[in-house]
Each structure stands twice: as structure tokens, then as C-alpha cells.
């Protein structure tokens, strides 16, 4: 049997049953999430659930730039350090950079400091690039 790999929307990339869109647009976290949702297919800001997934994403992004942080779908909606993925994925894999989680920083970004392999918390109203994800 021939198994066809699902296709992603133009400009999105495929990895292990998911499509990812890296948007070089400056948006705050909530606007970024709304923009991801606007593409349909159940798209949200991306959850990153393994080192392999993180490495694939990081390699892709590094082909565009190496200095700008990027919003992902991890947030702390209750502002009580109870982090969760906006797409409902289980929060098991963690890759925090070890920076302070204090202050009014309740949204997560991929940090450029470690080639996008680690995360930092940041203020949700910051306007930055963002990564969307959906399952085709």
C-alpha cells in the first residue's frame, strides 16, 4: 500500500503528522493565537512536546533568523505558574532556559539565546514572531 503524506498549507512545513507555520509578524500572544486559529484546521500557537520536535522546529527557524524570540502556545492563564498548552496537549516535556519566571511574564517564547531549543517566559503583550501548528 502507498501511504500518502498529508500536505500542509502553502508556506507551512510538515513534521511527524503536524503542520507548522512560522510567522515573521509582530503580534502579542493573544493576537498571535487568534491569527493561528484564523487558518482553521484546528490551528493554535504551537505546542512542543519532545526534544525531537523542538530540534526540527529550531532548525527550520534558524534558516530565517537567529535573534528574534518566537511565541509558542504555552501560557499561564491563571497567573499562578500553572503552565498549559493552548491546544490542550499534556504539559510533560519542558525546556525552560532557567531564567526567572517571576514578574508579569505569563506567556512562553522560544528563546534565541540557545538556538530556539529552550523557552523563556515573557510579558504576553510583547509583540513578537510566532509559531502555529495544526494536524492535517
Amino acid at each position: 500500500d502507498i501511504i500518502m503524506r498529508p500536505s500542509c498549507a502553502p508556506g507551512w512545513f510538515y513534521h511527524k503528522s503536524n503542520c507548522y507555520g512560522y510567522f515573521r509578524k509582530l503580534r502579542n500572544w493573544s493576537d498571535a493565537e487568534l491569527e493561528c486559529q484564523s487558518y482553521g484546521n484546528g490551528a493554535h500557537l504551537a505546542s512542543i512536546l519532545s526534544l525531537k520536535e523542538a530540534s526540527t522546529i529550531a532548525e527550520y527557524i534558524s534558516g530565517y533568523q537567529r535573534s528574534q524570540p518566537i511565541w509558542i502556545g504555552l501560557h499561564d492563564p491563571q497567573k499562578r505558574q500553572q503552565w498549559q498548552w493552548i491546544d490542550g496537549a499534556m504539559y510533560l516535556y519542558r525546556s525552560w532556559s532557567g531564567k526567572s519566571m517571576g514578574g508579569n511574564k505569563h506567556c512562553a517564547e522560544m528563546s534565541s539565546n540557545n538556538n530556539f531549543l529552550t523557552w523563556s517566559s515573557n510579558e504576553c503583550n510583547k509583540r513578537q514572531h510566532f509559531l502555529c501548528k495544526y494536524r492535517p
Epitope: 510567522f23 515573521r24 509578524k25 509582530l26 530565517y64 509583540r127
Partner: antibody
Framework: EVQLLESGGGLVQPGGSLRLSCAAS????????MSWVRQAPGKGLEWVSA????????YYADSVKGRFTISRDNSKNTLYLQMNSLRAEDTAVYYC??????????????WGQGTMVTVSS | QSVLTQPPSASGTPGQRVTISCSGS????????VYWYQQLPGLAPKLLIY???QRPSGVPDRFSGSESGTSASLAISGLRSEDEADYYC???????????FGGGTKVTVL
């Protein structure tokens, strides 16, 4: 207040050379990428070239690659465009533009008044 | 021919709302921010809108930007005579690895 002042334009024959300068003030020049953008008479805008704040990275439109060279002297707060092998289609007003709010060098925050380059025999 | 497509002209009477479209593709507007520039007659261009809908200080809120998919638009509400100018959209193009402009739209106030 950001100020950009171009100079060096003029009339030149096809195949000739010209060097444009852009004197910058009102911001920390070395911190920001700079670009040259041109506009042929009665036409739209066309990006020509860009340079990083340090001067270590340069970028060119295909239409000028190999003929134009962008450079900067951060000690003099000045941007340059060396134009060689000029063609009639290079005739345009040349603007220098700064990015003073973003790390993307295609975001032209402030513009100079422009300098006219005419390539004609 | 420009990578981004704009209508060559648009017009309206004072007080009206005028919208200018800018059409691109997934290699430019689809994944990159859109900027709008205003060029008054005989003057250098001026940044009007950045990052889709942000206005630099000094730009009236009559000007607004929006974006959807691979298209963007600039709206001028409460049109005034001093808005008569050329308007250009711009973004980055991933395929060309270069900034690109639309061909420009001349707005006339009737």
C-alpha cells in the same frame, strides 16, 4: 529627531560611476541597519541595498548585484553607495532609509529627501 | 511588474472612507508583516503603518491597516485633501530574499 541627508547625485554617462553619501544624525547610527531605496521618474519604489549596523552584512537587489557596493563609516555617521557600470535604467531618485525601531532591514522608519541620479549620454 | 499588487488609483470625496488593497502570496504577505508608506507630491516617502496595523507617533488614527491571509489593506476614513498622495505597501519576500513594494496607489480627493 532622525535626519538623513543624501548627496552625490548628478548626471553620468552609461558605464560611468557615482558615489552617493547619506549623513545621519539624531540616533545611534551604528545600532541600526540602513538601506538605499530608489524611485525612477514617475515609477514606484524599489529596494536597492541594505547593510547591518556593524557593516558586517550587506544585501543587494538582483538588479544591482555586482555593480553597486553599500558601505558605512560609523565613526562619521555616514552611509555610502558606490555605483559602477551605470545603466540608463538606474536613473532614479535614491533615498537612504533607516530602521530605527526594528531589527528587520526592510522596515524603513525614516527617509532622507533623496538625491537624483541621471544616467544618460 | 511589482510582486505586490495594488490598484493604480483610488478616489473619494472629503469625509469618505477609501480602502486600498495589496495582494501578495504565501512567500511574502502570508508570513511577513506589511508596512504602508505615504508619499506626498514631490516629497520622500513616510512610514504610515507598520506591523500590519501599528501607527508611528504623529500618524492620525484615520489611517488603519489590516491583513488577511495573503492580502492586506489600508483604510483612510474621514478623507481629507491633505491625504492626496501615493500609497505603497511593502513586506519581505522569502523567495526573493528581499524587501518588496507594491506598485503604488494614487489617492485623489475629489
Amino acid at each position: 529627531e532622525v535626519q538623513l541627508l543624501e548627496s552625490g547625485g548628478g548626471l553620468v554617462q552609461p558605464g560611468g560611476s557615482l558615489r552617493l553619501s547619506c549623513a545621519a544624525s539624531g540616533f545611534t547610527f551604528s545600532s541600526y541597519a540602513m538601506s538605499w531605496v530608489r524611485q525612477a521618474p514617475g515609477k514606484g519604489l524599489e529596494w536597492v541595498s541594505a547593510i547591518s549596523g556593524s557593516g558586517g552584512s550587506t544585501y543587494y537587489a538582483d538588479s544591482v548585484k555586482g555593480r553597486f557596493t553599500i558601505s558605512r563609516d560609523n565613526s562619521k555617521n555616514t552611509l555610502y553607495l558606490q555605483m559602477n557600470s551605470l545603466r540608463a535604467e538606474d536613473t532614479a531618485v535614491y533615498y537612504c532609509a533607516s530602521d530605527s525601531d526594528s531589527s528587520d532591514y526592510y522596515y524603513f522608519d525614516s527617509w532622507g529627501q533623496g538625491t537624483m541620479v541621471t544616467v544618460s549620454s | 511588474q511589482s510582486v505586490l499588487t495594488q490598484p493604480p488609483s483610488a478616489s473619494g470625496t472629503p469625509g469618505q472612507r477609501v480602502t486600498i488593497s495589496c495582494s501578495g502570496s504565501s512567500s511574502n504577505i502570508g508570513f511577513n508583516d506589511v508596512y504602508w508608506y505615504q508619499q506626498l507630491p514631490g516629497l520622500a516617502p513616510k512610514l504610515l503603518i507598520y506591523s500590519n496595523n501599528q501607527r508611528p507617533s504623529g500618524v492620525p488614527d484615520r489611517f488603519s491597516g489590516s491583513e488577511s491571509g495573503t492580502s492586506a489593506s489600508l483604510a483612510i476614513s474621514g478623507l481629507r485633501s491633505e491625504d492626496e498622495a501615493d500609497y505603497y505597501c511593502a513586506t519581505w519576500d522569502d523567495s526573493l530574499s528581499a524587501p518588496v513594494f507594491g506598485g503604488g496607489t494614487k489617492v485623489t480627493v475629489l
